[in-house]
Amino acid sequence: MAVTACQGLGFVVSLIGIAGIIAATCMDQWSTQDLYNNPVTAVFNYQGLWRSCVRESSGFTECRGYFTLLGLPAMLQAVRALMIVGIVLGAIGLLVSIFALKCIRIGSMEDSAKANMTLTSGIMFIVSGLCAIAGVSVFANMLVTNFWMSTANMYTGMGGMVQTVQTRYTFGAALFVGWVAGGLTLIGGVMMCIACRGLAPEETNYKAVSYHASGHSVAYKPGGFKASTGFGSNTKNKKIYDGGARTEDEVQSYPSKHDYV
């Protein structure tokens, strides 16, 4: 039950995270005009990855797309790329994880296949979250650099008579949405990887077969020796009277290829 819950929760958290990454990527408020010097401006500027907008005090808002690729800063292009890669990986991860969900039965899919798919989607979510966090962080760093550069030459004018105020930009709402969304996707991915360990099927425990000896009636259970080797799931040396049947989410402690992710 714990594995199903972990997997389900990981899926939901990742879903919310990826929705957030998509929202952040589409948002126009990656950077917003710093109002420290002029809190009562009648014109408010803000910029996104795809367009820049101006909201007038009158309520009129005008947005203009960046209709050039070559004229844009390399950093902005890099941020765009990171966010898109994050979205694509996250979307594929979601698709894979839907089929990997333990609560969904698809034909006669093996538990090992589900475990592999859960691990794959988990890794994709982790990379997706890291891409989003990296993208947002690169943009934030770019903003901080530009902010201090524009502060250094904030006012230019002739003899101090005429002032030309350079517009400074600070963190917009999209950055915080992106950081939170990236974090959620990352957490969701980790949860999927944890759930994968519990999903991996244990080595086949054959049904107990009774052998009737001449004088005694002994039930022989193959695999019982594992108690001493430390590799079997029966490390507590408990008797397997049910012929190897176990509950879905029973924790398995034997090492597998999934333990070293």
Partner: antibody, heavy 118, light 113 residues
Framework: EVQLVESGGGLVKPGGSRKLSCAAS????????MHWVRQAPEKGLEWVAY????????YYADTMKGRFTISRDNAKNTLFLQMTSLRSEDTAMYYC???????????WGQGTSVTVSS | DIVMTQSPSSLTVTAGEKVTLSCKSS????????????LTWYQQKPRQPPKLLIY???TRESGVPDRFTGSGSGTDFTLTISNVQAEDLTVYYC?????????FGAGTKLELK
């Protein structure tokens, strides 16, 4: 047809109060920010106050701050200007105006005259 | 506060001539976000409210005759009236639309020679 009609002006004693109204018609009042602008006799235009469409943002000219209060009732399509502690220098024609793109005022009322005198 | 300075304060003209009115601001009215200048021109006839002529320094309001042209950028702006008509002989105000408090120039009065 867009119409703005101011009312409430008149003779007021110094230190007195007055509430001006501006009735709007011919447009969706709740979609627009509104201004009060005044003009002293034989003088130029002086901006008084601004209120956004939903009343979330309000600005005042420094000389009016604390004495004047701008408000609006979108249900009644009416803009208000409550004036207190009036001085002789507040004597002017008060206009209400609609705020549009370019941060410009495209429609103005005919104005209401306020005279502050003892 | 942004100070708006209009010159001349009055101007004597003859019908049909071209007139240039000047307006200077103490601070740039150019918004970097959309490269638009937030300067507005109004016309006010006696005993009438002001009438919007031009916004964004050069965009003519609908219904305004094309003999009215706004130009300029940053801190220096002009309103040009080509082929002045008798009905144009009145007062013109420029207004800072970039920052609160919204400030008006003292006005330029056009008078008949």
């Amino acid at each position: 047809e867009v119409q703005l009609v101011e009312s409430g002006g008149g003779l007021v004693k110094p230190g007195g109060s007055r509430k001006l109204s501006c009735a709007a018609s011919g447009f969706t009042f709740s979609d627009y920010g509104m201004h009060w602008v005044r003009q002293a006799p034989e003088k130029g235009l002086e901006w008084v106050a601004y209120i956004s469409s939903g009343s979330s943002t309000i600005y005042y000219a420094d000389t009016m701050k604390g004495r004047f209060t701008i408000s609006r009732d979108n249900a009644k399509n009416t803009l208000f200007l409550q004036m207190t502690s009036l001085r002789s220098e507040d004597t002017a024609m008060y206009y209400c105006a609609r705020f549009v793109r370019g941060n410009s005022m495209d429609y103005w009322g005919q104005g209401t005259s306020v005279t502050v005198s003892s | 506060d942004i100070v708006m300075t209009q010159s001349p304060s009055s101007l004597t003209v003859t019908a049909g001539e071209k007139v240039t009115l000047s307006c200077k601001s103490s601070q740039s009215l150019l918004n970097s976000g959309n490269q638009k200048n937030y300067l507005t021109w109004y016309q006010q006839k006696p005993r009438q409210p002001p009438k919007l002529l031009i916004y964004w320094a050069s965009t003519r309001e609908s219904g305004v005759p094309d003999r009215f042209t706004g130009s300029g950028s940053g801190t220096d702006f002009t309103l040009t009236i080509s082929n002045v008509q008798a009905e144009d002989l009145t007062v013109y105000y420029c207004q800072n639309a970039y920052s609160y408090p919204l400030t008006f120039g003292a006005g330029t009065k056009l008078e008949l020679k």
